[in-house]
Amino acid sequence: LEVQVPEDPVVALVGTDATLCCSFSPEPGFSLAQLNLIWQLTDTKQLVHSFAEGQDQGSAYANRTALFPDLLAQGNASLRLQRVRVADEGSFTCFVSIRDFGSAAVSLQVAAPYSKPSMTLEPNKDLRPGDTVTITCSSYRGYPEAEVFWQDGQGVPLTGNVTTSQMANEQGLFDVHSVLRVVLGANGTYSCLVRNPVLQQDAHGSVTITGQPMTFP
């Protein structure tokens, strides 16, 4: 029995609903009484949802899953996962049994966009050319871990003296803090780009240090 699922991972935003597609080809004369359908976590085989004996057996996964009962008879065994969480990320197996059996696994990739970065400067006054300053770029509640890039006003990447830390909160979402240490010129713009690698979403923040009555020694 051929069971079909999408090759590419299903990407779902945290808090939204996701559909894990799964289909099979019912033979003529097929009835739902003949169908056994199991959705389970691929790695642990933990039961997620099942259909047996002509009836939806319900969710075994935090009551956040549902089948599409009106479509089952046409071979649509897809699973709806509601209010997606970071912890849902992984592989789900769709196991179909009639007079033969087949299974296939579909991957769920969870994502959350990062907030617009906030920029802080330390120290933030009485700055003179040649001073070393610390610029911190902070972006919150994203998933998965971000890629962080720094550049100057001319678009030149700044890779030295950058320290980036990412901490997951209780929901599994990441707060990213990236620190750039630079020696000031007469004036300058420093930009931070926080990229979500799954959503291909870039969040930008920048700070411009100008107008100081600075004299070079």
């Epitope: 029995l1 056994n36 199991i38 933990q46 047996a52 196991f95 049994s97 007079r99 033969d100 059996f101």
Partner: antibody
Framework: EVQLLESGGGLVEPGGSLRLSCAAS????????MHWVRQAPGKGLDWVAV????????YYADSVKGRFTISRDNSKSTLYLQMNSLRAEDTAVYYC???????????WGQGTTVTVSS | QSVLTQPPSASGTPGQRVTISCSGS????????VNWYQQLPGTAPKLLIY???QRPSGVPDRFSGSKSGTSASLAISGLQSEDEADYYC???????????FGGGTKLTVL
């Protein structure tokens, strides 16, 4: 009439190998999953392995995993069980059975006896 | 040790009604169907009940099956001497992706 006929059983020493066959007739063989089930002397039924119709999906009991291989040749309507590293506890009558709705096994062969002894 | 639990023996007199129980768990009987097999002495097993309560053609309506939660039962009414056999319940275990049998119940007709 739907029929399953096992063969290939016999006496083998511990550590040896044996290949069982099951010839099917009377139904569209490639459309159905097939099982092997065994029964040790005086004991109950013990599921061994299953294979789906096209031969792409298999599952095994933990007790035989890595030692037994289930396969099929749909052009010959034949099911196989390759048994390696045989142990005394593998001694049993081995039945091939046809997959049916709701995980049932609706047709059984007459069985073939495997004895593992030195 | 079997995953599904059956009483090792049961008995009854001709004409009586006998019930054989089968106890499982949420991941086998609680999730899927229960099937029952009859094995007459010296013969291969035969499917008696599938989908917890359905009889294949040729099985007398004296045999009936039921399921509730994680348990199932096989009832034989109007017991006959030819019903003397071993009876096995079976299911699919979704937590292991394996088929599981009960240990079998030997039915004696007194």
């Amino acid at each position: 009439e739907v029929q399953l006929l096992e063969s290939g059983g016999g006496l083998v020493e511990p550590g040896g190998s044996l290949r069982l066959s099951c010839a099917a007739s009377g139904f569209s063989f490639s459309s159905y999953g097939m099982h092997w089930v065994r029964q040790a002397p005086g004991k109950g039924l013990d599921w061994v392995a299953v294979i789906n119709g096209e031969g792409s999906g298999t599952y095994y009991a933990d007790s035989v995993k890595g030692r037994f291989t289930i396969s099929r040749d749909n052009s010959k309507s034949t099911l196989y069980l390759q048994m390696n590293s045989l142990r005394a506890e593998d001694t049993a009558v081995y039945y091939c059975t046809k997959y049916y709705y709701n995980y049932a096994m609706d047709v059984w062969g007459q069985g073939t006896t495997v004895t593992v002894s030195s | 040790q079997s995953v599904l639990t059956q009483p090792p023996s049961a008995s009854g007199t001709p004409g009586q009604r006998v019930t054989i129980s089968c106890s499982g768990s949420r991941t086998d009987i609680g999730t899927t169907s229960v099937n029952w097999y009859q094995q007459l002495p010296g013969t291969a097993p035969k499917l008696l009940i599938y989908q917890s309560h359905q009889r294949p053609s040729g099985v007398p309506d004296r045999f009936s099956g039921s399921k509730s939660g994680t348990s199932a039962s096989l009832a034989i009414s109007g017991l006959q001497s030819e019903d003397e056999a071993d009876y096995y319940c079976a299911s699919w275990d979704a937590s292991q992706n394996t088929w599981v049998f009960g240990g079998g119940t030997k039915l004696t007709v007194l």
